[in-house]
């Protein structure tokens, strides 16, 4: 079938990097600058994408490829081959289909990025907890109550029933 | 926060030429390209074209390709849109925009009137 | 040009009631489809980008969902203040194109 196609069809033979040129008697001619064609037989090539703006040049654009861009710092990228660019979170919150929102009651996201953990479960590890945790950070454990001196309490909040990550809408 | 303020209202004459400032404010205004869009009494948005600050690299609408200049001053942090050969049809509010793929904040728009 | 094709032009509602505003495009948009809020004095404001995210500060009761070509922005229970105009825009290829717009008003 490929030697059929090629027997009928001249352009078939041009390789990626080129453009079946029909004003040079369907000649494969190189892509011009700027441009590309990732596949062979093709009658024109593409013009490259520019990473302008927000948008940053993650990848140049080839004979054979397109550029690829990402976004700026303080922001990443949404869509197929980054076509949008979107804040990053703050510590606190987590990135979910409609946007930033804040870690549930029990959760933590200490970073810009990634998705509210639970807190540790100090209980769990026979320890009671030292430090409340907050949206942006974990509990911290300390000694286990049997260590405390007579009469010192600590509560110990209940592992929230939630899996990693979800966050509800 | 981010803010784009814009020039004031203009009443210009039929053939004259019209030039819309934008200051931006609240961010690295190089970093962001900036729109243009009109819209006329009564009717919808229409994109004009896009500049690039830090290049000075602009994408224009092949309908104002011929009659809009779009140029940033980025020791000031401004914008400019100028629109040349100006008819009775081109009476509309233009807005600044800037992109994020998506306009995220908008100018408040510049009344813009062609009247003889 | 990528022409956007919105729906319907005007409607006439009460608050609380559930509204739907539907965007086609004239080829597939691959998600990237924005909505912008107009009122009446001028001002435009981003209510959702890339489909269905939220901007920043806009309420849970806007909503959008969508794919390919055809999109949709709801507003669970209309309030007063969202008695505007609605715009889709497309941010798939230039120039970017928007939908004729939507007005909502009050019944």
């Known amino acids: 079938f490929e030697r059929t196609r090629s027997l009928q069809d001249p352009c078939s033979n041009c390789p990626a990097g080129t453009f079946c040129d029909n004003n040079r008697n369907q000649i494969c001619s190189p892509c011009p600058p700027n441009s590309f064609s990732s596949a062979g037989g093709q009658r024109t090539c593409d013009i490259c994408r520019q990473c302008k703006g927000v948008f940053r040049t993650r990848k140049e654009c080839s004979s054979t490829s397109n550029a690829e861009c990402d976004c700026t710092p303080g922001f990443h990228c949404l869509g197929a081959g980054c076509s949008m660019c979107e804040q990053d979170c703050k510590q606190g919150q987590e990135l979910t289909k409609k946007g930033c929102k804040d870690c549930c009651f029990g959760t933590f996201n200490d970073q810009k990025r990634g998705i509210c953990r639970p807190w540790t479960n100090c209980s769990l590890d026979g320890k009671s907890v030292l430090v409340n945790g907050t949206k942006e950070r974990d509990v911290v454990c300390g000694p286990s109550p049997a260590d405390l001196s007579p009469g010192a309490s600590s509560v110990t909040p209940p592992a929230p029933a939630r899996e990693p990550g979800h966050s509800p809408q | 926060q981010v803010q784009l303020v814009q020039s004031g209202a203009e009443v210009v004459k039929p053939g004259a030429s019209v030039k819309v400032s934008c200051k931006a404010s609240?961010?690295?205004?190089?970093?962001?390209?900036m729109h243009w869009v009109r819209q006329a009494p009564g009717q919808g948005l229409g994109w004009m074209g896009a500049?690039?600050?830090?290049?000075?690299?602009?994408d224009y609408n092949q309908k104002f390709k011929d009659r809009v200049t779009m140029t940033a001053d980025t020791s000031i942090s401004t914008a400019y849109m100028e629109l040349s050969r100006l008819r009775s049809d081109d009476t509309a509010v233009y807005y600044c925009?800037?992109?994020?793929?998506?306009?995220?904040?908008w100018g408040q728009g510049t009344l813009v009137t062609v009247s003889s | 040009d990528i022409q956007m094709t919105q729906s319907p032009s005007s409607l006439s509602a009460s608050v609380g009631d559930r509204v739907t505003i539907t965007c086609r495009a004239s080829?597939?948009?691959?998600?990237?489809l924005n909505w912008y809020q107009q009122k009446p004095g001028g001002a435009v404001k981003l209510l959702i980008y890339y489909t269905s995210r939220l901007h920043s500060g806009v309420p849970s009761r806007f909503s959008g969902s969508g794919s390919g070509t055809d999109y949709t922005l709801t507003i669970s229970s209309l309030q007063p203040e969202d008695f505007a105009t609605y715009f889709c825009?497309?941010?798939?290829?230039?120039?970017?194109?928007f939908g004729g717009g939507t007005k909502v008003e009050i019944r």
């Open positions: 825009q497309q941010s798939e290829k230039l120039p970017r194109t």
């Open positions: 500049i690039d600050p830090k290049t000075g690299g602009t």
């Open positions: 925009t800037r992109d994020l793929g998506y306009f995220d904040v």
């Open positions: 609240g961010y690295t205004f190089a970093g962001f390209e």
């Open positions: 080829q597939d948009i691959r998600s990237n």
